[in-house]
Amino acid sequence: LPAQVAFTPYAPEPGGTCRLREYYDQTAQMCCSKCPPGQHAKVFCTKTSDTVCDSCEDSTYTQLWNWVPECLSCGSRCSSDQVETQACTREQNRICTCRPGWYCALSKQEGCRLCAQLRKCRPGFGVARPGTETSDVVCKPCAPGTFSNTTSSTDICRPHQICHVVAIPGNASMDAVCTSTSPTRSMAPGAVHLPQPVSTRSQHTQPTPAPSTAPGTSFLLPVGPSPPAEGSTGD
């Protein structure tokens, strides 16, 4: 004969556990149903009645099967330096990530809590390490024979043009000026234009501090705390 299927609520076998999408209620001492994502427990189970679930209200959510009595509040609206990459629904929190030209200086569980503008390397300095979604640009002084004449978060130091006859010698912030009509460029290794990083979703890493910060680096904090983790995890 096949084993009888127990319907919730039911008392688990001694030392046994409840099934998937059920939880052990310590007060009722029964295995009871969890509520699906997008819902919460409106009425907890008793020995004879199962959990009663209800939909999350506007601007609240549950992402997991759960038995929380209240849905979690969605995070506050994304700030001006951020873009909303995931909307607040009954089943998921809003996710804000940094917009292009910014990086995540302080990440949270999902998305970013604090965005900062990418450092711009001033003339005489080039990008040594490009910015990522979670780290700032690292600038370095242009080595002899190279220059950067821009204030940029993407431009690297480029080699001076090689003149047959030099009119004005180049320096770290200016290219050489030739009198000759056909100057040539020396090919320095890695002399390529670095694209601006595309901001997608933040990871849990801290930004690396670096020298030569351009004046006016700004930080913007979103309003309000991030919501707490749900009361139950997994299925």
Partner: antibody, heavy 119, light 106 residues
């Protein structure tokens, strides 16, 4: 609005049985998630949960007093009755009834009734 | 049974002071804690449930926080009408009240 009121004897003798009635209005014990419980408070001391009953007749008792307590309900009369046997002077207290929400906390309380156990 | 250890048992503070009361459970109670205010000769009044959810009509100077076994109740700026005894209630595993904290004005 929700109201609860306790009634019962003000004085009982040791070894006697105490019977308390909670009469409530503003909600029904036939509604899913509704419960009524009893809590007591000896003079100058802390609150102590005694027992409660749910809409589906599920009952819970304080483990340390379980052998002495019985709770029942009369849904049509909007009443819950608690009996406590073998009363002792240490059971002298103010006895409160309170409504329980579906998520198990007490949200509305009666004014309380004082019971003295003395010979 | 879950035991609830509430501290301090009494405190004296000035009007405008920040007042903090703690309750420690003997086991994890999953945020199922409520806080009540009781004035002499009156029934307890629910202030907060599920750790931090304020009841409608309760002033925002009252707040709650915590998780696991440790919970805190705070009055951000004590008012004369807040003089009372405060109790925590755990309802994660049956029901147990803390021993109470009597709040007085200096």
């Amino acid at each position: 609005q929700v109201t609860l009121k306790e009634s019962g004897p003000a004085l009982v003798k040791p070894t006697q049985t105490l019977t308390l009635t909670c009469t409530f209005s503003g909600f029904s014990l036939s509604t899913s998630g509704m419960g009524v419980g009893w809590i007591r408070q000896p003079p100058g001391k802390a609150l102590e949960w005694l027992a409660h009953i749910w809409w589906d007749d599920d009952k819970f008792y304080n483990p340390s007093l379980k052998s002495r307590l019985t709770i029942s309900k009369d849904t049509s009369k909007n009443q819950v009755v608690l009996t406590m046997t073998n009363m002792d002077p240490v059971d002298t207290a103010t006895y409160y009834c309170a409504r329980l929400t579906g998520t198990r906390y007490f949200d509305y309380w009666g004014q309380g009734t004082t019971v003295t156990v003395s010979s | 049974d879950v035991q609830m250890t509430q501290s301090p048992s009494s405190l004296s503070a000035s009007v405008g002071d920040r007042v903090t009361i703690t309750c420690k459970a003997s086991q994890d109670i999953n945020k199922f804690i409520a806080w009540y205010q009781q004035k002499p000769g009156k029934a307890p009044k629910l202030l907060i449930h599920y750790t931090s959810t304020l009841q409608p009509g309760i002033p925002s100077r009252f707040s709650g926080s915590g998780s696991g076994r440790d919970y805190t109740f705070t009055i951000s700026s004590l008012q004369p009408e807040d003089i009372a005894t405060y109790y925590c209630l755990q309802y994660g595993n049956l029901w147990t009240f803390g021993g109470g904290t009597k709040v007085e004005i200096k």
